[in-house]
Interface confidence: low
């Protein structure tokens, strides 16, 4: 349905508060280095303009597309060339090329200082003094650090952020009330950002067919009682929502997401029995709840898949007549029967089934050729099952920190060319899979673990794409979305790698080490571990463990000393010399 003024349409649909929030997020995700005040000014100008269009849709410029309006506004920033360099060249282009150009310049790893959390009293004062500015600042700071954050979901996080301050700034012990809530929001926010980044990578790098396949599998697991036509409708709508958000069309995305939530709640009976409690909530909470809803119970009387997809003499006929729909139905039927499989495994099975049909339907006796297709699935299923089993055993044996260290060593040996900060970040996050998934019952372990690993490895892929250094990483990241994790798992020690020269500076530590938080201390030690492996890629586990134990003892000793700096100065070179000897 067309509107005379798109901006007026979205303003009326979303309301002023959400409109302003989404425009601020959009601008902050495009111009990540711009100061807060500059963005607020731009948002206020756009909002005032939108109001004139609501009053009179025929007013000047009200008929322009949102990309034209927003792009024109972004291109008024005076310091564009100095701050962003070649991104300023986007402004010489016409739509839609200009928006594509802005999208290409989004930076997944912007050079921004880490967010420092002020004292609780300082935060509460700022919240009470100007609540609106305080919340806008939250949207701005998160959006510029996470340029693909799912915008309507970020509004939900901001609402929770506001609720936390409203409650805790009244509490007797403000810190005890507020800090756990902020930690939870931070951790959930990082996870949400990473999950959305994978959706956008899937759409942008592999196309909407890849995203739709992912969505068919996931929604069929969640809604196994829904008919195929219903799942197809939800997949189509969900693909539109995420395509819009990933493309920077945040107002359309939020509007369509609200419509999808409305549709799901109006059609609960044909979707899932689990939606009821979500549908009583206000919009932002409702959409979040629907996205996170647990899997419905599987229908009790599902027939065997073999009849339609193996035993039938018409498999090739049906496949030839409607390849994507036939494969979609296969994926739907397989996924609804297997909530215990990861989405990525289900997609691999569908890919294997497709490959078998492509081969067999051209054979002399197709039925004979594809009769054993389900047997070919067995190794594909066993591989992630074994991986999860082995890694959960290792996690239970070592605990999180040492499990992360094992992964750091493993991944540094696989791809030693990758930067140390990236290896530390990615391996630490890979290591979190243990605490997240290994405590779950068997039937939930694989979907939890493998689908989480896909999200973490996507982070490695987007960081590596910005600064490519390893052909192996490029290969695993670009060849197949569904086989990324098996591709990385299969990598061995890089024999072609020339070990990094030893640099004593890398292993020189100071008294400031003693004042770091436990997490920061771990990152320091893990950084040193990566550097050690880069220096000695063939070092054994025992050798590395010995060096790391000595390192921990050395730091502990110096942090207990009266003159800490003198201790580090004296003991540091001894530690370095001993380490070199141990690794010789």
């Amino acid at each position: 349905d067309t509107h005379k003024s798109e901006v007026a349409h979205r303003f009326k649909d979303l309301g002023e508060e959400h409109f302003k929030g989404l425009v601020l997020v959009a601008f902050s995700q495009y111009l990540q280095q711009c100061p807060f005040e500059e963005h607020v000014k731009l948002v206020n100008e756009v909002t005032e303009f939108a109001k004139t269009c609501v009053a009179d849709e025929s007013a000047e410029n009200c008929d322009k597309s949102l990309h034209t309006l927003f792009g024109d506004k972004l291109c008024t920033v005076a310091t564009l060339r100095e701050t962003y360099g070649e991104m300023a060249d986007c402004c010489a282009k016409q739509e839609p090329e200009r928006n594509e150009c802005f999208l290409q310049h989004k930076d997944d790893n912007p050079n921004l200082p880490p967010l420092v959390r002020p004292e609780v009293d300082v935060m509460c004062t700022a919240f009470h003094d100007n609540e609106a500015t305080f919340l806008k600042k939250y949207l701005y700071e998160v959006a510029r650090r996470h340029p693909y954050f799912y915008a309507p979901e970020l509004l939900f996080f901001a609402a929770r952020y506001k609720a936390a301050f409203a409650e805790c700034c009244q509490a007797a012990d403000k810190a005890a009330c507020l800090l756990p809530k902020l930690d939870e929001l931070r951790d959930e926010g990082k996870a949400s950002s990473a999950k959305q980044r994978l959706k956008c990578a899937s759409l942008q790098k592999f196309g909407d067919r890849a995203f739709k396949a992912w969505a068919v599998a996931r929604l069929s697991q969640k809604f196994p009682k829904a008919e195929f036509a219903e799942v197809s409708k939800l997949v189509t709508d969900l693909t539109k929502v995420h395509t819009e958000c990933c493309h920077g069309d945040l107002l359309e995305c939020a509007d369509d997401r609200a419509d999808l939530a409305k549709y799901m709640c109006e059609n609960q009976d044909s979707i899932s029995s689990k939606l009821k409690e979500c549908c009583d909530k206000p919009l932002l909470e409702k959409s979040h709840c629907l996205a996170e809803v647990e899997n419905d119970e599987m229908p009790a009387d599902l027939p065997s898949l073999a009849a339609d997809y193996v035993e039938s003499k018409d498999v090739c006929k049906n496949y030839a007549e409607a390849k994507d729909v036939f494969l979609g139905m296969f994926l739907y039927e397989y996924a609804r029967r297997h909530p215990d499989y990861s989405v990525m495994l289900l997609l691999r099975l569908a890919k294997a089934y497709e490959a078998t049909l492509e081969k067999c339907c051209a054979a002399a006796d197709p039925h004979e050729c594809y009769a054993k297709v389900f047997d070919e699935f067995q190794p594909l299923v066993e591989e992630p099952q074994n991986l999860v089993k082995q890694n959960c055993e290792l996690f239970e044996q070592l605990g999180e920190y040492k499990f992360q260290n094992a992964l750091l060593v493993r991944y540094t040996k696989k791809v030693p060319q990758v930067s140390t900060p990236t290896l530390v970040e990615v391996s630490r996050n890979l290591g979190k899979v243990g605490a997240k998934c290994c405590k779950l019952p068997e039937a939930k372990r694989m979907p939890c673990a493998e689908d989480y690993l896909s999200v973490v490895l996507n982070r490695l892929c987007v960081l590596h794409e910005k600064t490519p250094v390893s052909e192996k990483v490029t290969k695993c990241c670009t060849e197949s979305l569904v086989n990324r994790r098996p591709c990385f798992s299969a990598l061995e020690l890089d024999e072609a790698y020339v070990p990094k020269a030893f640099n004593a500076e890398t292993f020189t530590f100071h008294a400031d080490m003693c004042t770091l938080s436990e997490k920061e201390k771990q990152v320091k030690k893990q950084t040193a571990l990566v550097e050690l492996v880069k220096h000695k890629p063939k070092a054994t586990k025992e050798q590395l463990k010995g060096v790391m134990d000595n390192f921990a003892a050395f730091v502990e000793k110096c942090c207990k000393a009266d003159d800490k700096e003198a201790c580090f100065a004296e003991e540091g070179p001894k530690f370095v010399a001993a380490s070199q000897a141990a690794l010789a």
């Epitope: 049906n318 409607a322 729909v325 139905m329």
Partner: nanobody
Amino acid sequence: QVQLVESGGGLVQPGGSLRLSCAASGFTFGRFGMSWVRQAPGKGPEWVSAIDSGGADTRYAESVKGRFTISRDNAKKTLYLQMNSLKPEDTAVYYCTIGRSTSRGSQGTQVTVSS
């Protein structure tokens, strides 16, 4: 999105006739083979009849051969099932599917044969 909407069901006496229709949207109907499937109360789905994308090749379950006729109009994106000489055992929910699948993708239309 794929949508299949059946109509034409109802209550009919043994020996009577009905014509079912299935209106399709959301995919290129003319490129797809289609089927009719039925599910009687308390039973699993049973494949009834199929037709290829052009309408030339038709197949029937033994239980309906000679009584039922499947056809299609690709211009109208509609699948039909002409049911003659109906018997009480034909009582079921009838639904159309893409290809030869017995997976139900729509609400279906109730056919009741009873005196």
